[in-house]
C-alpha cells in the first residue's frame, strides 16, 4: 500500500508521495534522494488504455488507473536506485551505490538441510510477528480515507506477513457500489488475466525483500514447493516444515507446528462488501487445511502430474484472447490452471496452480484468504519458476501480452494493484536471473514421447 510517511493529511491532500531520503536542512529538502542524484519527484505514469467491457463501473473503484485515486506524484529513481524514496536498490543489485550484482538461489524446500528448513520456518513466523517497517494499509476507501472529521488518515500498521496477505486481498476484492447495493465481483486485478504471473512475481519479490531486510540477510531466499508430484499427499505438510494435520481436528494444523498458532486476516468479507470497509490488521481464526480432503470433488484430491508442467511449457503463446480464464492455447491460463496442461480450455478443468490451491482444501483454497496459509508462498514460487522457464525458452516474448482490452488491471502497462512504488506488468516480464537477482535450482521434466511400434 503506501509508505508510512505518505499516510498523512498533507500527502493525501497534495497527492504527492515523495519522501525524503536524508533531509539535511529540514523536511522536503531531499525528496527521493535528489540531493545525491538518486532520483526525483515526478508525475505518476498510469495506464489509461481501455480495458475489456467486462468491468462496467469506471469511476467507482480506487484501483482504477492505480494509484491516481490516492497519489499523482511519486519518486522516479535513477539507474539501479529504487524504493519509495530511492533509498534501496533495484532487484538484483546491492551496495551503497547499488552497483554490486547479487544473485540469490530459490531452492526446493525438501532439498534444504534441517537447519535451513528451520531457518525458513522461523523466518516466516518472525515476519508474521514483525510490524512492517515501511508500509501501512488503508482501512477505508479513498472517499473516506481522511476519516469522519476529514483530518484523520485511516491507515493501520500491519505485520510483514499480514501485509503480504492484505495486498492479495486488496487486489481481488469486489468493487463496492454503495450501501444497499450488491458489490460487483467480476473483477480481479491479480487473477484470470495476463497479469496473473507478473503480479504474483512482484508479490513474492516484495515479501522476499521485506524478509531479507527484517533479517538483514541479503542472501535469504524463498524456497519452492514442487507440487507437481501426482500424489494425494502433501509432502511439505510435516511439523518441521509447514505443519502436519492435527489429530484433534482434521481441518487444522498440528499443535506441534508454529503455524497452528497463526491467525488469519481479511476474513470478514461480508462487512467489507456490505459496509464498504477494507480488511484491517485484525486477526481472526486459525488456518484451515485439509489436504486431499475434499471428497465432494475427487478431481481436486490429487496434485498435478510432473508431465503437466512439461506439457504447459510447450504452450508457446503467453496469452490469447479474450485474455481471461477461458483463453485457449494461453500459457498463462494453462499454468494458472483454467485450461488443461496442453492449453485447451475446459470449464470443468482445474489444473496446475489452481489445482494445488484447491487440493489444500481450506484457507489456501479461498482466493481472498489464500496467502494466510504460508504454503501459498511455496506454491507461488514454484509457479513463478515455471513462468521463468517459459520466459527463458521463449525469449520473454511479450508480444501476446495485451497493451489494451485485457480485464481491468491486466493491460501490459498497468501499475499492479496495490504495490508501491508503482510497478508495471512489463517490469516483471523479464528473466529473473538476468534482471531480478534470483534464480531457481530446479530440473524440469522433459516430455515423454511414445514411440509407435
Amino acid at each position: 500500500q503506501f509508505p508510512r510517511q505518505c499516510a498523512t493529511v498533507e500527502a493525501l491532500r497534495s497527492g504527492m508521495c515523495c519522501p525524503d531520503l536524508s533531509p539535511v536542512s529540514g523536511p522536503g529538502t531531499d525528496r527521493c534522494g535528489s540531493s545525491s542524484g538518486r532520483g526525483r519527484c515526478e508525475a505518476v505514469t498510469a495506464d489509461s488504455r481501455p480495458h475489456s467491457p467486462q468491468y462496467p463501473h469506471d469511476g467507482r473503484d480506487d484501483r482504477e488507473v492505480w494509484p491516481l485515486r490516492f497519489f499523482n506524484r511519486t519518486c522516479h529513481c535513477n539507474g539501479n536506485f529504487s524504493g519509495h524514496n530511492c533509498g534501496t536498490c533495484r532487484p538484483g543489485w546491492r551496495g551503497a551505490a547499488c552497483d554490486q550484482r547479487v544473485l540469490i538461489v530459490r531452492r526446493n524446500l525438501l532439498d534444504l538441510s534441517k537447519e535451513e528448513k528451520n531457518h525458513f520456518v522461523r523466518a516466516l513466523d518472525m515476519a508474521k510477528r514483525t510490524t512492517h517497517p515501511l508500509f501501512v494499509i488503508a482501512t477505508r476507501r479513498s472517499e473516506e480515507i481522511l476519516g469522519p472529521d476529514g483530518n484523520t488518515p485511516q491507515f493501520e500498521n500491519i505485520s510483514i506477513y499480514n501485509y503480504f496477505v492484505w495486498t492479495h486481498y486488496y487486489s481481488v476484492k469486489k468493487t463496492f457500489l454503495g450501501v444497499g447495493q450488491e458489490s460487483f465481483g467480476e473483477v480481479d486485478f491479480s487473477h484470470e488475466g495476463p497479469a496473473f504471473l507478473t503480479w504474483h512475481r512482484y508479490h513474492l519479490l516484495r515479501l522476499e525483500k521485506d524478509m531479507q531486510e527484517m533479517l538483514q540477510e541479503p542472501s535469504f531466499s524463498l524456497p519452492y514447493w514442487n507440487f507437481a508430484t501426482g500424489k494425494n499427499v502433501c509432502d511439505i505438510c510435516t511439523d518441521d516444515l509447514m505443519g502436519s494435520r492435527s489429530n484433534f481436528d482434521s481441518t487444522l494444523i498440528s499443535p506441534n507446528s508454529v503455524f497452528s498458532q497463526w491467525r488469519v486476516v481479511c476474513d470478514s468479507l461480508e462487512d467489507y462488501d456490505t459496509l464498504g470497509t477494507l480488511c484491517n490488521s485484525t486477526e481472526d481464526g486459525p488456518i484451515r487445511r485439509n489436504p486431499a480432503g475434499n471428497v465432494a470433488r475427487p478431481m481436486v484430491q490429487r496434485l498435478p502430474e510432473p508431465q503437466d508442467v512439461a506439457q504447459c511449457l510447450e504452450v508457446g503463446l503467453f496469452d490469447t484472447p479474450p485474455f481471461y480464464s477461458n483463453s485457449t492455447n494461453s500459457f498463462r491460463n494453462t499454468v494458472e490452471g483454467y485450461s488443461d496442461p496442453t492449453g485447451k480450455y475446459d470449464p470443468a478443468v482445474r489444473s496446475l496452480h489452481n489445482l494445488a490451491h484447491l487440493f489444500l482444501n481450506g484457507t489456501g483454497g479461498q482466493t481472498h484468504l489464500s496467502p494466510n496459509d504460508p504454503i501459498f508462498v511455496l506454491l507461488h514460487t514454484f509457479t513463478d519458476a515455471v513462468f521463468d522457464e517459459w520466459l527463458r525458452r521463449y525469449n520473454a516474448d511479450i508480444s501476446t501480452f495485451p497493451l489494451e482490452n485485457a480485464p481491468i488491471g491486466h493491460n501490459r502497462q498497468y501499475n499492479m494493484v496495490p504495490f508501491w512504488p508503482p510497478v508495471t506488468n512489463t517490469e516483471m516480464f523479464v528473466t529473473a536471473p538476468d534482471n531480478l537477482g534470483y534464480t531457481y535450482e530446479i530440473q524440469w521434466p522433459s516430455r515423454e514421447f511414445s514411440v509407435p511400434e
Partner: antibody, heavy 119, light 107 residues
C-alpha cells in the same frame, strides 16, 4: 576500513545498571545487523543476540531476555547494550560484531568491554 | 538447540607440526560452520566460514573441511603466532552457538 570502537571498562555494584556503547565506522551502519557476544573470564564465547540496525528490532538469545536491552542511535552509528540489575555472574567481556558478510559470520569485532560486578 | 563439541580440549604441538582440530554438531548444520582464533586479551578473529572458505587475509596454511555434523580445521605447518584458542561456531535462526574451544599450546 571497518572499525568498531567500544566504550571502556566498567566496575559496578550488584543491582546497578551499565550501558556499553559500540561505535561503528567504515561502512553503512544501518546495512548490517549488530551482534553482541559475551565471554566470561576464562570461558568461551556466548551469543547474546542481535539488533536489526535498520528497524531497531532486537532478537535475544535464550537467557538474555529481561535484563538485557539492545538499542542504537543511527545518527552516530552506535549500538548500545544495557544490562540492568547486575549480578556477579554478569562479569564478562562484551563484544559487538556486525554481521558484515552475507554469510552470517562475524568478520569484524569490537575490542571488547570488560564489565566487572563486585560489591 | 544445536550443541557444538570441540576436541581435544587442549592440543600440545611444536612449531612446524600439523594441527587438526575437530568440531562435532549435535545435528546437521549443513556447511554453516565457521572457525575463529582468539589470542589472550584480543577479540576473536574469523579464519574459516561456510566450513571450508578462508576469510580475507587468512594464510593458506589454514584449511577447513566437513559438512553435516563433523568438521575439521587443519593448520598444515604451525607458526609461533598460531598458538591460541580456536572456536567453531554455527548459525541457527540468527543466533550463534560456539563450541567450548580448543586450546592450541606450544609443546
Amino acid at each position: 576500513q571497518v572499525q568498531l570502537v567500544q566504550s571502556g571498562s566498567e566496575l559496578k555494584k550488584p543491582g546497578a545498571s551499565v550501558k556499553i556503547s559500540c561505535k561503528a565506522s567504515g561502512y553503512t551502519f544501518t546495512s548490517y545487523a549488530m551482534n553482541w557476544v559475551r565471554q566470561a573470564p576464562g570461558q568461551g564465547l556466548e551469543s547474546m543476540g542481535w539488533i536489526n540496525t535498520n528497524t531497531g528490532n532486537p532478537t535475544y538469545a535464550q537467557g538474555f531476555t529481561g535484563r538485557f536491552v539492545f538499542s542504537m542511535d543511527t545518527s552516530v552509528s552506535t549500538a548500545y547494550l544495557q544490562i540492568s540489575s547486575l549480578k556477579a555472574e554478569d562479569t564478562a567481556i562484551y563484544y559487538c560484531a556486525p554481521r558484515y558478510s552475507s554469510s552470517w559470520y562475524l568478520d569484524y569485532w569490537g575490542q571488547g568491554t570488560l564489565v566487572t560486578v563486585s560489591s | 538447540e544445536i550443541v557444538l563439541t570441540q576436541s581435544p580440549a587442549t592440543l600440545s604441538l611444536s612449531p612446524g607440526e600439523r594441527a587438526t582440530l575437530s568440531c562435532r554438531a549435535s545435528q546437521s548444520v549443513s556447511s554453516y560452520l565457521a572457525w575463529y582464533q582468539q589470542k589472550p586479551g584480543q577479540a576473536p578473529r574469523l579464519l574459516i566460514y561456510d566450513a571450508s572458505n578462508r576469510a580475507t587475509g587468512i594464510p593458506a596454511r589454514f584449511s577447513g573441511s566437513g559438512s553435516g555434523t563433523d568438521f575439521t580445521i587443519t593448520i598444515s605447518s604451525l607458526e609461533p603466532e598460531d598458538f591460541a584458542v580456536y572456536y567453531c561456531q554455527q548459525r541457527s535462526n540468527w543466533l550463534y552457538t560456539f563450541g567450548q574451544g580448543t586450546k592450541l599450546e606450544i609443546k
